[in-house]
């Protein structure tokens, strides 16, 4: 039994890091393998992660962490019974994939302005809480070409757009994702989308 593709890990910089790897053949990950991980810090104990299958030869493990700071480093040991298959390390702050924002809501009752709000996925005491920026994707269910991205580069989890920038009388969907420049993170997954019917008063044309 050998490791074909070494484990690669990403952290949500809060409580979970996810590691994936591939074996050289079909493997029952949960019965045959164990991933041991330990924070390099005084008195930290080693923890065991039981991997799940991720395709025939692929395995995935969700490492639980109490908290994360930028200097944290973990040792990783992949075992098959008494055999050490792979030894490595992982620095969560260098491989961050933020959590997806939640509670995306479209408020349509503010004159002819659409107000989109969502929730920051981190608690205020987490370092990323004040460092996330967002991308909001709005698209028409009727017209695949009507697809736009708004970059929200300020901290407030909201976006105002004029309803008139969208077509009236049709349904739109929106979703939002996050990233943090400070850690050069990847983008988060998209939030669940929300749907609304866009309607606004056309301005009265004078002849």
């Amino acid at each position: 039994m050998k490791v074909l593709q070494e484990p690669t890990c990403v952290s949500d910089y809060m409580s979970i890091s996810t590691c994936e790897w591939k074996m050289n053949g079909p493997t029952n990950c949960s019965t045959e393998l164990r991933l041991l991980y330990q924070l390099v810090f005084l008195l930290s104990e080693a923890h065991t992660c039981i991997p799940e299958n991720n395709g025939g030869a692929g395995c995935v493990c969700h490492l639980l962490m109490d908290d994360v700071v930028s200097a944290d480093n973990y040792t990783l040991d992949l075992w098959a019974g008494q055999q050490l298959l792979w030894k490595g390390s992982f620095k969560p702050s260098e491989h961050v994939k933020p959590r997806a924002p939640g509670n995306l809501t479209v408020h349509t009752n503010v004159s002819d302005t659409l107000l989109l709000t969502w929730s920051n996925p981190y608690p205020p005491d987490n370092y990323l809480y004040n460092h996330l920026t967002y991308a909001v994707n709005i698209w028409s269910e009727n017209d695949p070409a009507d697809f736009r991205i708004y970059n929200v580069t300020y901290l407030e989890p909201s976006l105002r757009i004029a309803a008139s920038t969208l077509k009236s009388g049709i349904s739109y969907r929106a979703r939002v994702r996050a990233w943090a420049q400070c850690y050069n993170t990847t983008w988060s997954e998209w939030s669940p989308s929300t749907k609304w019917h866009n309607s606004y008063r056309e301005p009265f044309e004078q002849h």
């Epitope: 390099v40 810090f41 005084l42 008195l43 104990e45 700071v69 200097a71 370092y127």
Partner: antibody, heavy 125, light 106 residues
Framework: QLQLVESGGGLVQPGGSLRLSCAAS????????MTWVRQAPGKGLEWVSA????????NYADSVKGRVTISRDNAKNTLYLQMNSLKPEDTAVYFC??????????????????WGQGTQVTVSS | SYELTQSPSVSVALRQTAKITCGGN??????AQWYQQKPGQAPVLVIY???RRPSGIPERFSGSNSGNTATLTVSGAQAEDEADYYC?????????FGGGTRLTVL
Amino acid sequence: QLQLVESGGGLVQPGGSLRLSCAASGFTFSSYDMTWVRQAPGKGLEWVSAINSGGGSTNYADSVKGRVTISRDNAKNTLYLQMNSLKPEDTAVYFCARALRTVVHDRRLFYIDSWGQGTQVTVSS
Amino acid sequence: SYELTQSPSVSVALRQTAKITCGGNNIGSKSAQWYQQKPGQAPVLVIYADSRRPSGIPERFSGSNSGNTATLTVSGAQAEDEADYYCQVWDTSAVVFGGGTRLTVL
């Protein structure tokens, strides 16, 4: 109030053994990491060993590794330091202390917030 | 292994400001603590997390930490501040103390 009282020190010959104890009171002993720090005559502080709250994890200074064992009995609110193969350079006052691990401003801390008065260990022939 | 360097002694006139430094490679990326020890007594924590004061420690004690130097400042030093002062950090799997600085109040 919080109290840490060391005992078990004394005069021992090189190569001998000694077991230090530290009786804790005034706080929930089983919830805290504990540590030993020593101070040779006229010298500075030197960390010796630490143990986590449940007793499942320990760390040792290189200078004592393999000769010293830290342990605790949470039912008795007592911390121990078993010292073997003692050398003259182990002569010091040994302090038992309560340690805290926490996170502040995106950095991990390990610090000592309470100390006992110490017990003298002298290794001499 | 990680090392912390302190000057052996610092003198300060009564009610003046004393600065005690602790040097270490990139110590600013770590969290520094300071302990006060008077002759024949156990040490006492005076600063933790670079600049936080435990309850009961006078406001004249303050701390800072950046680059390769952590600093303990005693503003308006009193006679009772005469003591040895030790800086401390953690590194990998060890606790590291500086060699100590004797503060003399003149």
